[in-house]
Amino acid sequence: LPAQVAFTPYAPEPGGTCRLREYYDQTAQMCCSKCPPGQHAKVFCTKTSDTVCDSCEDSTYTQLWNWVPECLSCGSRCSSDQVETQACTREQNRICTCRPGWYCALSKQEGCRLCAQLRKCRPGFGVARPGTETSDVVCKPCAPGTFSNTTSSTDICRPHQICHVVAIPGNASMDAVCTSTSPTRSMAPGAVHLPQPVSTRSQHTQPTPAPSTAPGTSFLLPVGPSPPAEGSTGD
């Protein structure tokens, strides 16, 4: 004989478990229905009645089958420096990503706790490793025969142009200057321009000014080349 199909709520077999999309209610001691994503348990089940589900209110969500009494609140709106890559719906939380030119410096379970601006390599330095959604740019000094005359988070060190007659030799931050005859560019592996990295989930605010120095010291830190601009925590 085929096994009987049990309808919720029902008492599980001794040592047995509830089926998929069901949960065991300790109070009723019954297997009861979970609520689908986008809903929550408005009324819990009893021995004779199943779970009553209701839709999540605005700005709240549930992403999984559940029996929570209240839907989860969506995260706060993305700041003006962020891009909303996933809107808040009844079934999913809002996701904010670091804007282009920024990376996630400190991640959290859902998204990013702290965004920071990608490092810009100064003249004489080129990008050794491009930034990614979760890592900063790594700069390196331009090796002999190469140069970078830009402040950039994407430019690598480029080879000096090869002159028939050199007017001014190149250095790490300046290309060679040739006399009027047309120069040739030495071959360099890879492109000069690296693409901007894809952003990641994030929360950040406007870059903060450089902090002041430690107590009891007479000098403060430089105003010049700004160390990393970072956002505040997004919690």
């Epitope: 390599c121 100064r122 490793r129 890592s135 000094p141 120095t213 160390p227």
Partner: antibody, heavy 121, light 107 residues
């Protein structure tokens, strides 16, 4: 206010090991590159090791390469220096320093108070 | 490695005098040079960066200059709080070496 507090220094025999820590506060730790710098009893300064903000890039001075390891825990706002095969020449005051933001802002802008390491039998 | 030759190693001067400390590099470092001041029993402190730029809050009597591979730190009209040891450093290729220091004592 930015603070860097070193700990873990002490007296160790040649060939021994020591682990230094640096607890940081007052700034967004995970966005800054950090270094260890030491000062010998003769007052000479020597850069020891560097780690970038994400912990991806590390550089070492030739005198400690293969013996010392720099690391960081961005969740704990802590910088570390594991020192092994210690020599008498490693005797120094060890400073935890913020910087350089290498390739962009090339300087050490904050220094801790230092922790003393003495290697002697 | 890049050698930083700092001079003089020490000097004694009076309040009000002017002093110039120099640092010569064994190869070009493209202005990637900070100067630090260290007072007795204290940690070093940033004074100048990029060879010529004063750190915020540093008095204008301090100035940095460069000429080729020679870098200089000048202090006009020395004040009592200026006495201590001064170090140059480079941030070109690793290892990032320091000069030997200049101990500035009060006469």
């Amino acid at each position: 206010e930015v603070q860097l507090q070193e700990s873990g220094g002490g007296l160790v025999q040649p060939g021994g090991s020591l682990n230094l820590s640096c607890a940081a506060s007052g700034f967004a730790f995970s966005t800054y590159d950090l270094s260890w710098v030491r000062q010998t009893p003769e007052k000479r300064l020597e850069w020891v090791a560097y780690i970038n903000n994400g912990g991806i890039s590390t550089y070492y001075s030739d005198t400690v390469k293969g013996r010392f390891t720099i690391s960081r825990d961005n969740a704990k706002n802590t910088l570390y220096l594991q020192m092994s095969s210690l020599k008498s020449e490693d005797t120094a005051m060890y400073y935890c320093v913020r910087g350089p933001f290498y390739g962009s802002a090339n300087y050490f802008d904050y220094w801790g108070q230092g922790t003393t390491v003495t290697v002697s039998s | 490695e890049i050698v930083m030759t700092q001079s003089p190693a020490s000097l004694s001067l009076s309040v009000g005098e002017t002093v110039t400390i120099t640092c010569r590099t064994s190869e070009s470092i493209y202005s990637n040079l900070p100067w630090y001041q260290q007072k007795q029993g204290k940690s070093p402190q940033l004074l100048v960066y990029d060879a010529t730029k004063l750190a915020e809050g540093v008095p204008s009597r301090f100035s940095g200059s460069e000429s080729g591979t020679q870098y200089s730190l000048k202090i006009n009209s020395l004040q009592s709080e200026d006495f201590g040891t001064y170090y140059c450093q480079h941030f070109w290729v690793t290892p990032w070496t320091f000069g030997g220091g200049t101990k500035l004592e009060i006469k």
